[in-house]
C-alpha cells in the first residue's frame, strides 16, 4: 500500500533571466527512493539515480543544475520555461509517486513564490 505523500514548492514564479529551485520531498513512507525523474510536460530534464547519480539531458545541460538534494535548479529563465514540472519518485516497494510544480516566469521584477502544498 502506498502511504507516502509528496510535498512540492507548489505554484511558483520567478523573474526572466533569473534562476529557481524546483524541490519535492517524499514523506510518510519508509520506501527506498531508487530514482527521481524531473520532467517538463513530456520532456525529460534530468534523472537522479540513487546509485549512479545525476544525468542531465543534453538539451538542458547549459541551464539545468542538479540539486540541492533531489531538487533541480533552473537557470537563465525565459518566458518559455513557464509551465508544469513533475518530480517522479520511483520507490521500492511502493512504486511511483508524482509531484507537480507550476512555474510562471515573469517579465517584471515582482516574482512571488506560491504556497507549498501536498499531493497524496
Amino acid at each position: 500500500m502506498m502511504t507516502g505523500t509528496i510535498e512540492t514548492t507548489g505554484n511558483i514564479s520567478a523573474e526572466k533571466g533569473g534562476s529557481i529551485i524546483l524541490q519535492c520531498h517524499l514523506s510518510s513512507t519508509t520506501a527506498q527512493v531508487t530514482q527521481v525523474n524531473w520532467e517538463q510536460q513530456d520532456q525529460l530534464l534530468a534523472i537522479c539515480n540513487a546509485d549512479l547519480g545525476w544525468h542531465i539531458s543534453p538539451s538542458f545541460k547549459d541551464r539545468v543544475a542538479p540539486g540541492p538534494g533531489l531538487g533541480l535548479t533552473l537557470q537563465s529563465l525565459t518566458v518559455n520555461d513557464t509551465g508544469e514540472y513533475f518530480c517522479i519518485y520511483h520507490t521500492y516497494p511502493d512504486g511511483t509517486y508524482t509531484g507537480r510544480i507550476f512555474l510562471e516566469v515573469l517579465e517584471s521584477s515582482v516574482a512571488e513564490h506560491g504556497a507549498r502544498f501536498q499531493i497524496p
Partner: antibody
C-alpha cells in the same frame, strides 16, 4: 569493431559463488556503462544491474542486491559479475551488454552483447 | 518496477507475410523503448531504439512505433532469417525491464 568476449561455462554446487568475466575491445572501455542480463533455460531476459567502468559505481536490481557484485579492471578492459549463494534457480546464461550512449546511463539501450556464459547450479 | 507485457506469446506467420508484435508498459516510458531479436543459442541482437529508430544495419522491413505505454514492432515481409524471439525493453527507469518475448514461428 566492438567485441565483448565472456568467460567459459561453469558448473557450481548450491551455496557456491561464480565469477563471470567480460572483456571489451574495439572502443574506449571507460566511456560506456556495462549491463548484465541473464536468461534461464527457455525463459526471457532478466536485468541484473549495471556498472560504470570509469568510476566503478554500480546499480543492482533489488532481487539480486546482497548476492551480486559487479567490478571492473580498467587495465584489462574487463568487467566481472560475481553471484554468490547460488541456487538451482540461478542456472542460466549470463550476458554482459554495452550501453550505447557515451558517458552516461541514459538514454542507453544495449547495443552490443557478449556471447553469453552458461552457469549451471547442480548438486 | 515497470512491467512490460508482450503479446501474443507466439505468432505463426508464413514467409512473405506481415508480422505485428505488441508491447505494453505498466506506466509511461515515453519513447525509451528498444526491441531485440534472439535466435536459439545466440545472444540478443539490437533492432530498434527510441521506439522507432532502426539500429545500424537493420533492414527496412523492421519498423517500430508507439509512445507512452503502447508499442508495436512490425516486420513488413517476413524472411526465413526473421523467425526468432523478439523482446521489448524499457530504459527510462531502473531496473530496466524486458517483456516476456514473442516467438515468431513459421506457419
Amino acid at each position: 569493431q566492438v567485441q565483448l568476449v565472456q568467460s567459459g561455462a561453469e558448473v557450481k554446487k548450491p551455496g557456491a559463488s561464480v565469477k563471470v568475466s567480460c572483456k571489451a575491445s574495439g572502443y574506449t572501455f571507460t566511456s560506456h556503462y556495462m549491463g548484465w542480463v541473464r536468461q534461464a533455460p527457455g525463459q526471457g531476459l532478466e536485468w541484473m544491474g549495471i556498472i560504470n567502468p570509469s568510476m566503478g559505481a554500480t546499480s543492482y536490481t533489488q532481487k539480486f542486491r546482497g548476492r551480486v557484485t559487479m567490478t571492473r579492471d580498467t587495465s584489462t578492459s574487463t568487467v566481472y559479475m560475481e553471484l554468490s549463494s547460488l541456487r538451482s534457480e540461478d542456472t542460466a546464461v549470463y550476458y554482459c551488454a554495452r550501453l550505447h550512449v557515451s558517458g552516461s546511463y541514459y538514454p542507453a539501450y544495449l547495443d552490443y552483447w557478449g556471447q553469453g556464459t552458461m552457469v549451471t547450479v547442480s548438486s | 518496477e515497470i512491467v512490460m507485457t508482450q503479446s501474443p506469446a507466439t505468432l505463426s506467420v508464413s514467409p512473405g507475410e506481415r508480422a505485428t508484435l505488441s508491447c505494453r508498459a505498466s506506466q509511461s516510458v515515453s519513447s525509451n523503448l528498444a526491441w531485440y531479436q534472439q535466435k536459439p543459442g545466440q545472444a540478443p541482437r539490437h533492432l530498434i531504439y527510441g521506439a522507432s529508430t532502426r539500429a545500424t544495419g537493420i533492414p527496412a522491413r523492421f519498423s517500430g512505433s508507439g509512445s507512452g505505454t503502447e508499442f508495436t514492432l512490425t516486420i513488413s515481409s517476413l524472411q526465413s532469417e526473421d523467425f526468432a524471439v523478439y523482446y521489448c525493453q524499457q530504459y527510462i527507469v531502473f531496473p530496466w525491464t524486458f517483456g516476456g518475448g514473442t516467438k515468431v514461428e513459421i506457419k
